[in-house]
């Protein structure tokens, strides 16, 4: 996309080099205004690779609470409702940005941090290694 | 762990109420140091609900580039490698936080924004509505 010249109303910044400290308004804007009706929160039960959600809380992090997926089985649920170990349930992971209080216990000073979270599980064909 | 009173080295904050502006160091700390060897980037091909990844770029957002999953099929891949329409491929979505430049085009001023991203796909049993 085209980058337009810096807005003259921007806050002044002394140092333009990385690492740099920026101002962030924590009043979250929600872009998901028309919550997708197709978006289902029961997929974790209906999936052939079902998962449980585990609560992870860290008051030094923003967001403090993250719910993480853990696959229920090593295999996948087949048409009979049994676990088929010829297939594998695996976590789908995503790197997300969070804010970490820095220095610790400060309400208004953070550092960006990248963490890996498991969002759900999917059923995959295993990679079979044939031994010669 | 033990929480000490608010760190005296914290930047001063006038207003503790929402909305509030905080300082964020954009020098990202990566907590995923020992990247999980089990974390596979080929699940999107091996899944019974495979997906493609689409690049979404927005220079007014941080991070500017986000990769989004789109399920390849309405159904799921069966043991024969065919699409089984008795099952559904559905996106696993997650709400993530990003930074949005505010005012626009400012390099050092942002607002937190919540967006919904599709991370991958999973195969679910459809909900069947029986008509009387």
């Amino acid at each position: 996309g085209i980058t337009i010249p810096r807005n003259p109303g921007c806050p002044n910044s002394e140092d333009k080099n990385f690492p740099r400290t920026v101002m962030v308004n924590l009043n979250i804007h929600n872009r998901n205004t028309n919550t997708n009706p197709k978006r289902s929160s029961d997929y974790y039960n209906r999936s052939t690779s079902p998962w449980n959600l585990h609560r992870n809380e860290d008051p030094e992090r923003y967001p403090s609470v993250i719910w993480e997926a853990k696959c229920r089985h090593l295999g996948c649920i087949n048409a009979d409702g049994n676990v088929d170990y010829h297939m594998n349930s695996v976590p789908i992971q995503q790197e997300i940005l969070v804010l970490r209080r820095e220095p610790p216990h400060c309400p208004n000073s953070f550092r960006l941090e990248k963490i890996l979270v498991s969002v759900g599980c999917t059923c995959v064909t295993p990679i079979v290694h044939h031994v010669a | 762990g033990i929480t000490i009173p608010r760190n005296p080295g914290c930047p001063n904050s006038e207003d503790k109420n929402f909305p509030r502006t905080v300082m964020v160091n954009l020098n990202i700390h990566n907590r995923n140091t020992n990247t999980n060897p089990k974390r596979s980037s080929d699940y999107y091909n091996r899944s019974t609900s495979p997906w493609n990844l689409h690049r979404n770029e927005d220079p007014e957002r941080y991070p500017s580039v986000i990769w989004e999953a789109k399920c390849r099929h309405l159904g799921c891949i069966n043991a024969d490698g065919n699409v089984d329409y008795h099952m559904n491929s559905v996106p696993i979505q997650q709400e993530i936080l990003v930074l949005r430049r505010e005012p626009p085009h400012c390099p050092n001023s942002f607002r937190l924004e919540k967006i919904l991203v599709s991370v991958g796909c999973t195969c679910v049993t459809p909900i069947v509505h029986h008509v009387a």
Partner: antibody, heavy 121, light 106 residues
Framework: EVQLVQSGAEVKKPGSSVKVSCKAS????????IHWVRQAPGQGLEWMGV????????FYNQKFDGRVTITADKSTSTAYMELSSLRSEDTAVYYC??????????????WGQGTTVTVSS | EIVLTQSPDFQSVTPKEKVTITCSAS?????IYWFQQKPDQSPKRWIY???ELASGVPSRFSGSGSGTDYTLTINSLEAEDAATYYC?????????FGQGTKLEIK
């Protein structure tokens, strides 16, 4: 104005189930978890569990041994707490309370008005 | 589970008096929360994250402590402070509350 409005009082027989609702308004429902806390007559407060309306995740106090189920309906911004296999010791006032997911040190900042559940044969 | 023990269970106090309620945890915790509850009312968040007063709480209240020992202090008691106060921890599951301290005005 933030409000958590709970359903009315219930009288139940031992062995039956009760489902209490908690309708939220005045804030973004999915930004907050809903926790449930109960208080037996003349007693203190007891945490029962939590539901995250955003992900659907739930976590329970093991004391309730699978008897409690907490759910939420995003379309109506309503949380539910169902308690099964009721016994006389479950007679209590049941409260819902919201909890900000992003900055948890704020704690449970708004509570419902409470729902009295009486278990009696 | 972490047991929170409040002291005293009951206190009858004269207006303008200084009041101290303590909350002792069986294991070290990160933060303590205090709730005020009046008869036939829901609990109200009173002090959060050990030190911070909730909106609308008079400045005569304060919170302190760390590790296993926490305190709620009322500098100069007023009639409207008559209530039961509960401490609460959420550092470890299951989340727990103290048994409560009932303050009565003489």
């Amino acid at each position: 104005e933030v409000q958590l409005v709970q359903s009315g009082a219930e009288v139940k027989k031992p062995g039956s189930s009760v489902k209490v609702s908690c309708k939220a308004s005045g804030y973004t429902f999915t930004d907050y978890e809903i926790h449930w806390v109960r208080q037996a007559p003349g007693q203190g407060l007891e945490w029962m569990g939590v539901n995250d309306p955003e992900s659907g995740g739930t976590f329970y106090n093991q004391k309730f041994d699978g008897r409690v189920t907490i759910t939420a309906d995003k379309s109506t911004s309503t949380a539910y707490m169902e308690l099964s296999s009721l016994r006389s010791e479950d007679t209590a006032v049941y409260y819902c309370a919201r909890y900000y997911r992003y900055e948890s040190f704020y704690g449970m900042d708004y509570w419902g008005q409470g729902t009295t559940v009486t278990v009696s044969s | 589970e972490i047991v929170l023990t409040q002291s005293p269970d009951f206190q009858s106090v004269t207006p303008k008096e200084k009041v101290t309620i303590t909350c002792s945890a069986s294991s070290s915790i990160s933060y303590i929360y205090w709730f005020q509850q009046k008869p036939d009312q829901s609990p109200k968040r009173w002090i959060y994250a050990t030190f911070e007063l909730a909106s609308g709480v008079p400045s005569r209240f304060s919170g302190s402590g760390s590790g296993t020992d926490y305190t709620l202090t009322i500098n100069s008691l007023e009639a409207e402070d008559a209530a039961t106060y509960y401490c609460h921890q959420r550092s470890s599951y299951p989340w727990t509350f103290g048994q409560g301290t009932k303050l009565e005005i003489k």
